[in-house]
Interface confidence: low
Amino acid sequence: EEELQMIQPEKLLLVAVGESATLNCTVTSLLPVGPVLWFRGVGPGRELIYNQKEGHFPRVTTVSDLTKRNNMDFSIRISSITPADAGTYYCVKFRKGSPENVEFKSGPGTEMALRAKPSAPVVSGPAARATPEHTVSFTCKSHGFSPRDITLKWFKNGNELSDFQTNVDPAGQSVSYSIRSTARVVLAPWDVRSQVTCEVAHVTLQGDPLRGTANLSEAIRVPPTLEVTQQPMRAGNQVNITYQVRNFYPQNLQLTWLENGNVCRTETASTLTENKDGTYNWTSWLLVNTSDQRDDVVLTCQVKHDGQLAVNKSLVLEVSAHQKDQSSDATH
């Protein structure tokens, strides 16, 4: 006689909450005589899911007519799936016996797992700003999805990035999974207006991926370029010193004027002009009266940008020999 095989073709069944699940089971022989029962789990604590002979199973229906003489299909359908239904389901053949039927053979089991969408990806940037040509890391996290296979891509201004590392946890079997990916981005001076996007594709999303974004403006510091010029005023003994601070980001900037090492004015950047790339320019003026100067004046402008070390730019105002003479005369 042909040896009985219990065939459960699906190793894994993915079902969303509220859906129906069909658990397939066919047998290859009608012998030995006896019923086929469905259980969830194994061992003494297993739960009876369906018994064709007795019991009340309101959410379970059979796929085919079990009363037919030559029926070999013992598949069942469970309606209104809830998270409590997750587990491994076994169809089990019993041999007719006395006083009780005896378990004869079990199918390999079908794991029913919930299908769940990933959460909206959350992208976080580095803890501290970095300057252009440095590399910063962005992290993307999404959780709560099942099954485990998921595709994650990174984009910068719509262009796909390749330098990233992705991990899906846990490695073993689980009800749901989480993904964490870290992308490395090399900053460019024009990245103030740039954006990185993390895109997550999953079987539950039906081809409509979820996206999370972060602005590089939160991660970049563009240090200023400094330019100092002097213009004599028509008044004669006055010089206008112009200090131009260009292409910096963020706005947080403090400027201190020093005359021969002594602080003469401190100001915080307020009226800024914004460049197309998102960086800022700022101009500061200092009017210096040279009429009462006996020696050359060293004017230093000290710029402190976004909490970084101050950058100095100095200019020597040369006092003419005639002025020096007048000055010395006045002191005698």
Epitope: K11, L12, R148, D149, T151, T166, A171, Q173, V175
Partner: antibody, heavy 126, light 113 residues
Framework: QVQLVQSGAEVKKPGASVKVSCKAS????????INWVRQAPGQGLEWMGW????????GYAQKFQGRVTMTRDTSTSTVYMELSSLRSEDTAVYYC???????????????????WGQGTLVTVSS | DIVMTQSPDSLAVSLGERATINCRSS????????????LAWYQQKPGQPPKLLIY???TRESGVPDRFSGSGSGTDFTLTISSLQAEDVAVYYC?????????FGQGTKLEIK
Amino acid sequence: QVQLVQSGAEVKKPGASVKVSCKASGGTFSSYDINWVRQAPGQGLEWMGWMNPNSGNTGYAQKFQGRVTMTRDTSTSTVYMELSSLRSEDTAVYYCARDLTLYCSSTSCLDAFDYWGQGTLVTVSS
Amino acid sequence: DIVMTQSPDSLAVSLGERATINCRSSQSVLYSSNNKNYLAWYQQKPGQPPKLLIYWASTRESGVPDRFSGSGSGTDFTLTISSLQAEDVAVYYCQQYYSTPPTFGQGTKLEIK
């Protein structure tokens, strides 16, 4: 019957790179993770990493981070493992192995390895 | 990483006798939500790739003779060959696949006495 067929033996100089291929036949190529495991002469087995041919996702052992790259060509059902900056201690037989993925349908589950390639001997010598 | 330690390193058993190989993991490989041990056993013959014998600590792979059996849970596992045959001479490895990276034992060489 699933078969994993690997490329032939290679001899490389220290500092060079080697790229080993693993061609799958007789099964659904994209439904299972392909892992790479190496075995130095007379030594045990050491896992290097995995790739899901469907999504292109990879996971590498910390030891090989930065030196190993796994890629795939879905048109030929082939997965590749490239190891760079070779040193003499990289001399080993390199195996590709398919995940058993008992409870996973084309997902990246870590699992036992049910099908193995025949192995590719990579010798690193100056 | 989980460290897998096998004992003994080598073993000589007479034909028809029972062979027992032990494997211990540095942490539990039992996953509580499905009550499964993420442990496999492999057989490797000279010049061949490893062959999967047992997974989930005790489930025999299709086509593996029933003289091979696996037992144990948590951190301590055993591979038993009930009646050694000449073709069973090989190196046997245990492997955990509970967490990344999957790790193997150092191997146990089984010979005929």
